[in-house]
């Protein structure tokens, strides 16, 4: 008995071939011997089966001795043994229809779980293997689960159902709703304008929700909400903003925030959350601000950084075009009695300068100049 695998919602064509290459009488029946369709001369006739409106054949092939049964919009319950009667012969074809669906919406938040459920006919024992867009393979039976979805899981999942050494392939498009970056860090000199950008890693026609930026300043004992906003069809409107600092927000996507100036008291970490309409859970992006200040007080030239810096970073003070006078794994370094000239304060990681601030040290009788 020939086995054919079909996909729920698809169309399947079951073949039946006569030895004579001409149009002769044929019938397709199900396992209960109920006629599905056949012919009367060159006319297609249909029986009283449940497939009535979904069953068809290809009249153009009858003259070649081919009498296929075409079933459209397959259902799991169409799984059955179909019998083609032609030339006093009976050809049996077992059709097994499978369906694979995502547990809920195919638009899931980062960190949520994806469950794929296999619908299969009674008596079948299929195995399923799915390959994610990033090449990760998962195997299972009736259900497959992937916890903690990541951004790289966005895209087409290819799932293969195996039964009786036959395969049927499903493709499911999954969209992971997330920000492009989980975390970002901005390095600024004191007084500079700060731009925070929160690009989304997905595009949808209509995007509605609400968001908030909570900020934990390094110098503060507790975090506070800096801004809350609404999102209506990709249009941003600010609901509430603190007076200090007074953030400005762009009216269109991507979400964009401007801090008028970087100050040591603002250095720290923020968490932007975005709650999307009709979705449980929130999108998160962490943002960090590191602020540098170079100052000269009397005979002491000091360079300081505030904010979440890695212990791998080096802070250096050097006279322009000379070797560093001091270079340490600290957030503050200083030079006593600095000689006159342009001094550079450098924050570097693996030899790459992340932040630089220049300060001009004048001969002792003058006051310092900050360019």
């Amino acid at each position: 008995k020939k086995v054919v695998l079909g996909k729920k919602g698809d169309t399947v064509e079951l073949t039946c071939t006569a030895s004579q290459k001409k149009s002769i009488q044929f019938h397709w029946k199900n396992s209960n011997q109920i006629k599905i369709l056949g012919n009367q001369g060159s006319f297609l006739t249909k029986g009283p089966s449940k497939l009535n409106d979904r069953a068809d054949s290809r009249r153009s092939l009858w003259d070649q001795g081919n009498f296929p049964l075409i079933i459209k919009n397959l259902k799991i319950e169409d799984s059955d043994t179909y019998i083609c009667e032609v030339e006093d012969q009976k050809e049996e074809v077992q059709l097994l229809v499978f369906g694979l669906t995502a547990n809920s919406d195919t638009h899931l938040l980062q960190g949520q779980s994806l469950t794929l459920t296999l619908e299969s006919p009674p008596g079948s024992s299929p195995s399923v293997q799915c390959r994610s867009p990033r090449g990760k393979n998962i195997q299972g039976g009736k259900t497959l689960s992937v916890s903690q979805l990541e951004l790289q899981d966005s895209g087409t999942w290819t799932c293969t159902v195996l039964q009786n050494q036959k395969k049927v392939e499903f493709k499911i498009d999954i969209v992971v709703l997330a920000f492009q970056k989980a975390s970002s860090i901005v390095y600024k000199k004191e007084g500079e304008q700060v731009e925070f950008s929160f690009p989304l890693a997905f595009t949808v026609e209509k995007l509605t929700g609400s968001g908030e930026l909570w900020w934990q300043a390094e110098r503060a004992s507790s975090s506070k909400s800096w801004i809350t906003f609404d999102l209506k069809n990709k249009e941003v409107s600010v609901k509430r903003v603190t007076q200090d600092p007074k953030l400005q927000m762009g009216k269109k996507l991507p979400l964009h925030l401007t801090l008028p100036q970087a100050l040591p008291q603002y250095a720290g970490s923020g968490n932007l959350t975005l709650a999307l309409e009709a979705k449980t859970g929130k999108l998160h992006q962490e943002v960090n601000l590191v602020v540098m200040r170079a100052t000269q007080l009397q005979k002491n030239l000091t360079c300081e950084v505030w904010g979440p810096t890695s212990p791998k970073l080096m802070l250096s003070l050097k006279l322009e075009n000379k070797e560093a006078k001091v270079s340490k794994r600290e957030k503050a370094v200083w030079v006593l009695n600095p000689e006159a000239g342009m001094w550079q304060c450098l924050l570097s990681d693996s030899g790459q300068v992340l932040l630089e601030s220049n300060i001009k040290v004048l001969p002792t009788w003058s006051t310092p100049v900050q360019p």
Epitope: T309, S316, K328, K331, S350, G351, Q352
Partner: antibody, heavy 119, light 113 residues
Framework: QVQLVQSGAEVKKPGASVKVSCKAS????????INWVRQAPGQGLEWIGW????????GYAQKFQGRVTMTRDTSTSTVYMELSSLRSEDTAVYYC????????????WGQGTLVTVSS | DIVMTQSPDSLAVSLGERATINCKSS????????????LAWYQQKPGQPPKLLIY???TRESGVPDRFSGSGSGTDFTLTISSLQAEDVAVYYC?????????FGQGTRLEIK
């Protein structure tokens, strides 16, 4: 896991220059820093300087300023250390070593290149 | 530059016994900003390059046997081998990387008694 493979031994005359190479095999330089450290026969370890092969930035010990030049060829994942105006006291094994980018300390070392300075 | 001084210069210990090597820095290598001691220990066997054993004064590098441990803070540090094995015969170096340039101790030769 990246490995560092160095060029072979060199014999040089005083006043000449030597150029030692250090190639990343089984990987590429990420945001790594490559240090150069030398060891005179029967002596301890002495740091010469560092280079970031991605940015090209360098930093040299005061003692070697003006005599040492570190360069790189990103297409072959190779860094070079050139020491000029050689003198007999530069006879040593020269090592390249990677600064661990995630933790700290020099976690991957080349096998060493013996440079002999002799008239 | 920070000067690193190791003691003793050489040490002979019986197999299975404890070996202790000291390292002193001329100034503190403890970062008050990050609360970390920027000190590493290396092992060098004859004809081989050094091998990283310990970083941040007390964190063992992956794959290093747990008989090796590092301790200390500020200016005084210790490398301890709890039970000496034959393969531990080597020269051991401490190195500070708190301040540039990084500097090494002169080395301690460890032998079997």
């Amino acid at each position: 896991q990246v490995q560092l493979v160095q060029s072979g031994a060199e014999v040089k005359k005083p006043g000449a220059s030597v150029k030692v190479s250090c190639k990343a095999s089984g990987g590429t330089f990420r945001n790594d820093v490559i240090n150069w450290v030398r060891q005179a026969p029967g002596q301890g370890l002495e740091w010469i300087g560092w280079m970031n092969p991605n940015s090209g930035n360098t930093g040299y010990a005061q003692k070697f300023q003006g005599r040492v030049t570190m360069t790189r060829d990103t297409s072959t994942s190779t860094v070079y250390m050139e020491l000029s105006s050689l003198r007999s006291e530069d006879t040593a094994v020269y090592y390249c070593a990677r600064d661990n980018p995630d933790l700290d300390g020099m976690d991957v070392w080349g096998q060493g290149t013996l440079v002999t300075v002799s008239s | 530059d920070i000067v690193m001084t190791q003691s003793p210069d050489s040490l002979a210990v019986s197999l299975g016994e404890r070996a202790t090597i000291n390292c002193k820095s001329s100034q503190s290598v403890l970062s008050s900003s990050y609360n970390k001691n920027y000190l590493a220990w290396y092992q060098q066997k004859p004809g081989q390059p050094p091998k990283l054993l310990i970083y941040w004064a007390s964190t063992r590098e992956s794959g290093v046997p747990d008989r090796f441990s590092g301790s200390g803070s500020g200016t005084d540090f210790t490398l301890t081998i709890s039970s000496l094995q034959a393969e531990d015969v080597a020269v051991y170096y401490c190195q500070q990387y708190y301040s540039s340039p990084p500097t090494f101790g002169q080395g301690t030769r460890l032998e079997i008694k």
